[in-house]
Amino acid sequence: GELETSDVVTVVLGQDAKLPCFYRGDSGEQVGQVAWARVDAGEGAQELALLHSKYGLHVSPAYEGRVEQPPPPRNPLDGSVLLRNAVQADEGEYECRVSTFPAGSFQARLRLRVLVPPLPSLNPGPALEEGQGLTLAASCTAEGSPAPSVTWDTEVKGTTSSRSFKHSRSAAVTSEFHLVPSRSMNGQPLTCVVSHPGLLQDQRITHILHVSFLAEASVRGLEDQNLWHIGREGAMLKCLSEGQPPPSYNWTRLDGPLPSGVRVDGDTLGFPPLTTEHSGIYVCHVSNEFSSRDSQVTVDVLDPQEDSGKQVDLVSAS
């Protein structure tokens, strides 16, 4: 007869490991008992379990409640056992020693490999601002056994660097993604992809990029100067800019306070029926946590009774 087992049994942390040991005997041969022991190098054999044809299953106190026989029906020549809820410390060498009649004793060894799937974490880098040089966008760390693979999935142009730390029973891998921030990256996904033999599918953690910037400001509403005449209703100026975080707007008049009746509504300055009083230099001040911009325009309200038009100046300042 001969023993049938596996060289390596691989199981994911927390799952049950079947340790196979089957005696392929000749007709009439019987298995009296199967002794399972852990036999790591440099240490004596440690009892796991004893399967006896008459006495049944004896489990070592160290493995009490964790070792069982596979569910029925059972072949009397099958000395396999189930190790419940495998933990990392279970990883190692195991031996089954089979006592048969009349052929004598046989033994075989196998290695139990316990895969520890990683639980990845993604940490965003410092705040990204347009105009910075190469900056850390995010780092992704995953620890497992064996060492996981950490890569990045993104449309954003950047560079990656990885480092690994070996522990006694696992390895931690950290990958960093660096980029030169630009406003076009705003809202773009940056995904950390972790691969590991203990995972059914890759684990993905997505971070949305936020790049602080503030565009130049400009004012719209004075495109047709002839519309700005005494008595006109619904005249308005709109301040144009964009930024991250979204900017706030403030209107002032350079040559005095805002005339009465003029309404400020965020980026819009609304006028009552126009009078010559409304002529002046208006300043739109745009700001966010990153920067601030100004744009100023000169409003000249025309008197329709006058023939000659006035020149309108548009000045933008930062």
């Epitope: 008992q33 022991a37 009892e47 006896h52 006495y55 049944g56 299953l57």
Partner: antibody, heavy 123, light 107 residues
Amino acid sequence: EVQLVESGGGLVQPGGSLRLSCAASGFTFGTYGMSWVRQAPGKGLEWVSGIKPGDSTTYYADSVKGRFTISRDNSKNTLYLQMNSLRAEDTAVYYCARAELLAFDVYTASDYWGQGTLVTVSS
Amino acid sequence: DIQMTQSPSSLSASVGDRVTITCRASQGISSYLAWYQQKPGKAPKLLIYAASSLQSGVPSRFSGSGSGTDFTLTISSLQPEDFATYYCQQHYTTPPTFGQGTKVEIK
């Protein structure tokens, strides 16, 4: 024929010592686990101590730990129990018994027993 | 330590009666259970090992059953020589422990 014969029992004062012997024959003594089991007058059976074949690892009941010592001489096919600091509650018939080692520290039932030797601890 | 609880502690029966003695372990012991018979002034005698296996030379009227925590010794037809005290013993762990015994007396 398997035989186990105990000797060495007798009357001893509290605090005294006694050495019991168990002579084995009819089987390969060195390959069996051996144990001592006692029975106080009118009481049930109580396991006292055991010794493994091979490396002679020893085991004791809490009630005798530190006072009793089990040993074996495989060349003489003899099991011993050295009893020190004896107490009145150690009064009992002491039996030696054999059991086959299956594996590790797992044994069969004790299939052969000696006839016993009486130990009386009294002043 | 594993506690072994035997019941009843004593019983009276007549020759030819069917007698059942039970033994319960405080935790699972698979089939690492033996039954012994002891007569006054004599050493215990192994009747049943591995919960249900009959020791060589023991009459077939003795039988054992059970596994795990609950075990039974049955004497199918009590004979005069069967009046004695019966003990169960677990040898799953060290220390091996005995039940308190069941005395079978003549009715």
